[in-house]
């Protein structure tokens, strides 16, 4: 009994058969998040959990200085979750007195990073304006989409403010992708 | 025509070729939940339509008593949306006249439960804070993430409060995992 | 060594081994969208790219007029967010005097046409009540789930109100669905 | 070496307004959230307020919200505590200290404290 | 708001006791929670963040344990520096609260 024999008609023989068990596949876990140098105009990335309780790399999918890599090409389902949690931001009709302390918003980059590339690719953005009214506020963002990607490039997290990020649950924060 | 013959070279020969038709999944619906007994700190499991409608589980991925029930050890990915609905909650200054409408957060955990082990797990969060200004609310929480999960091993969704998830329709709030 | 030899007991024969990278796929995103004729009670549908930037099609999976087709049986994830944006949403005491710039709510519906079938089946949505204090709101909605699609399906994305869409960016909204 | 300095303590009557200062000096002080920290005479501590490293996000205690209020100068290694419409129960050594990335987290370096007295 | 409960509220200890303060939370805090020492006109000190992290710099019969709600910080062995009032906070959520206090005094 051969691969093709039930192969639909229209499948390419040029197409490789792979055993799903060895595609590359990460699930990273959010840790408390170290000083990092803020540029004007630029989202700091998030540094992850790669091996402990949720977090694992598998098959070549490696984890290292805040990035994902590629280790082969092909179409990547690719998913992260951040929580935001902060005080007090006034936003309403005393909003125009300027108070520095207001977040005008909450946003994730989910951002690829080809080497051959001068200028990183955003796959994914989340972006939310928060007006709290309330003295204690958190409510996460959610992504997720297929990608093409290439052997080698990067992936990274990015947000807008990492001092706003609830590292307090492995469940709460986290960045995966998987080969399809 | 032989299966090995154009795998790449990193595929390993112990990797089980499979036909991806054949493997578990299931897309679980909402229903009206009925009341339930829980206890302090403990949120509620929600239960679902497995057959009806949009629903449906396949390949051993078996539904009983709100927990999807894994039938074969590997990558999953599981999801799950749940939308709430509820009443003014006002919830500035005025909050600590401690109205009894008005919850401080929703949250959406989904959980596995492996029998030899005796806490659950919680394996994705989704959580946010509820200050409303208007008469009626309603929003959706959204979680999506992959994890290793054993056979055996049993997924549910819980709520911080049962009475205010939307069971009116069947696209609003669902519950799915499948085998990768 | 031949596909079968090392498959799982439970694995049947019948189930074609099918290669990967020959799956209908697709990452669909947004465009400014054009003024469209839209019925009393039914929401909009929003069109897309296909083809430029992030955005693809492969495999059969093809876009066409606002669809995308599904070119073979089977089940598909299928996912998007649309990111929402808009001025002022006054909605507390002074609610009742009818601002028209106040939409009560955002939704996304992912929707199947199916062509023997005389009703569209309402496959997700995602829908959010719309109560900002602040001048201007932003913020998306995420979908995804797992669905048995037949030959000549077709997928759409209907929103509430076409003209609150984010189409500024290809990473803010975006519609797609692969073969599982 | 980290350390943190308040000044503008005193003896201040009720209704009256205080501001308290804290210099920071010994590590990057734009890179950390901030706090103040109060001990009453005899009893526990109890946090007063926090502020982000960008004064992004802000909190108080509810014992001092609406009369208290928080800031900083990132170009001054300074912290600031704006403290109107006092009471007797302000009465307290009030602590500066230094927390970590996320304003919710715990202190890991404190000033000696300056001493606020509201007596009529 | 978490409330914290410290216990007890005085010990009294000789030098080489093992001493043991418990912590509990109103509702789960995970390991989200630190050690302070103050001694008599000084600023408190760090000795353990998340329930059981031994701060740089702090000896090392100072330890912590617990997560949840019932936690502990043990001195395996008092010494004459230990006798001071210790301090346990939350920082799970806002607003960041502290427990009453255990003085440590010489028996």
């Known amino acids: 009994l051969k691969g093709q024999e039930f192969a639909p008609s229209h499948q390419q023989v040029y197409a490789p058969l792979r055993a799903d068990g060895d595609k590359p596949r990460a699930h990273l876990t959010v840790v408390r998040q170290t000083p990092t140098q803020h540029f004007k105009n630029q989202f700091p990335a998030l540094h992850w959990e790669h091996e402990l309780g949720l977090a694992f790399t598998k098959n070549r999918m490696n984890y290292t200085n805040k990035f994902l890599l590629i280790p082969e090409s092909g179409d990547y389902f690719i998913y992260s979750q951040v929580t935001f949690r902060g005080m007090t931001s006034e936003c309403s009709e005393i909003r125009q007195a300027g108070r520095p302390n207001k977040p005008d918003s909450i946003t994730v980059v989910i951002t690829k990073v080809t080497d051959s590339y001068p200028e990183p690719t955003q796959l994914l953005m989340g972006t939310k304006s928060v007006c709290e009214v309330g003295s204690n506020w958190f409510q996460p963002i959610y992504l997720g989409a297929m990608f093409s990607l290439q052997e080698g490039d990067k992936l990274m997290v990015n947000v807008s403010d990492i001092s706003l990020v609830d590292y307090t649950k492995e469940d709460k924060t986290f960045f995966g992708a998987f080969l399809l | 025509l032989k299966g090995q013959e154009f795998a790449p070279s990193h595929q390993q020969v112990y990797a089980p070729l499979r036909a991806d038709g054949d493997k578990p999944r299931a897309h679980l619906t909402v229903v009206r939940q009925t009341p339930t007994q829980h206890f302090k700190n403990q949120f509620p499991a929600l239960h679902w339509e497995h057959e009806l409608g949009l629903a449906f589980t396949k390949n051993r991925m078996n539904y009983t008593n709100k927990f999807l029930l894994i039938p074969e050890s590997g990558d999953y990915f599981i999801y799950s949306q749940v939308t709430f609905r509820g009443m003014t909650s006002e919830c500035s200054e005025i909050r600590q006249a401690g109205r009894p409408n008005k919850p401080d957060s929703i949250t959406v955990v989904i959980t596995k439960v492996t029998d030899s082990y005796p806490e659950p797990t919680q394996l994705l969060m989704g959580t946010k804070s509820v200050c409303e200004v208007g008469s009626n609310w309603f929003q959706p929480i959204y979680l999506g993430a992959m994890f290793s999960l054993q056979e055996g091993d049993k997924l549910m969704v819980n709520v911080s409060d049962i009475s205010l998830v939307d069971y009116t329709k069947e696209d609003k709030t669902f519950f799915g995992a499948f085998l990768l | 060594l031949k596909g079968q030899e090392f498959a799982p007991s439970h694995q049947q024969v019948y189930a074609p081994l099918r290669a990967d990278g020959d799956k209908p796929r697709a990452h669909l995103t947004v465009v400014r969208q054009t003024p469209t004729q839209h019925f009393k009670n039914q929401f909009p549908a929003l069109h897309w790219e296909h083809e430029l930037g992030l955005a693809f099609t492969k495999n059969r999976m093809n876009y066409t007029n606002k669809f995308l087709l599904i070119p073979e049986s089977g089940d598909y994830f299928i996912y998007s967010q649309v990111t929402f944006r808009g001025m002022t949403s006054e909605c507390s005491e002074i609610r009742q005097a009818g601002r028209p710039n106040k939409p009560d709510s955002i939704t996304v519906v992912i929707t199947k046409v199916t062509d023997s079938y005389p009703e569209p089946t309402q496959l997700l949505m995602g829908t959010k009540s719309v109560c900002e204090v602040g001048s201007n709101w932003f913020q998306p909605i995420y979908l995804g789930a797992m669905f048995s699609l037949q030959e000549g399906d077709k997928l759409m994305v209907n929103v509430s109100d076409i003209s609150l869409v984010d189409y500024t960016k290809e990473d803010k909204t975006f519609f797609g669905a692969f073969l599982l | 070496e980290v350390q943190l300095v308040e000044s503008g303590g005193g003896l201040v009557q009720p209704g009256r307004s205080l501001r308290l200062s804290c210099a920071a000096s010994?590590?990057?002080?734009?890179?950390?959230?901030m706090h103040w920290v109060r001990q009453a005479p005899g009893k526990g501590l109890e946090w007063v307020s926090g502020i982000s490293w960008n004064s992004g996000s802000i909190g108080y205690a509810d014992s001092v919200k609406g009369r208290f209020t928080i800031s900083r100068d990132n170009a001054k290694n300074s912290l600031y505590l704006q403290m109107n419409s006092l009471r007797a129960e302000d009465t307290a050594v009030y602590y500066c200290?230094?927390?970590?990335?996320?304003?919710?987290?715990?202190?890991?370096?404190w000033g000696q404290g300056t001493l606020v007295t509201v007596s009529s | 708001d978490i409330q914290m409960t410290q216990s007890p509220s005085t010990l009294s200890a000789s030098v080489g006791d093992r001493v043991t303060i418990t912590c509990r939370a109103s509702?789960?805090?995970?390991?989200?929670l630190a050690w302070y020492q103050q001694k008599p006109g000084k600023a408190p000190k760090l000795l353990i963040y998340d329930a059981s992290s031994l701060e740089s710099g702090v000896p090392s019969r100072f330890s912590g344990s617990g997560s949840g709600t019932e936690f502990t910080l043990t001195i395996s062995s008092l010494q004459p520096d230990d006798f001071a009032t210790y301090y346990c906070e939350q920082y799970n959520s806002y607003p960041l609260t502290f427990g009453g206090g255990t003085k440590v005094e010489i028996k």
């Open positions: 509702q789960s805090i995970s390991s989200w």
């Open positions: 200290a230094k927390g970590q990335v996320a304003p919710l987290d715990h202190f890991d370096y």
């Open positions: 010994g590590f990057t002080f734009d890179d950390y959230a």
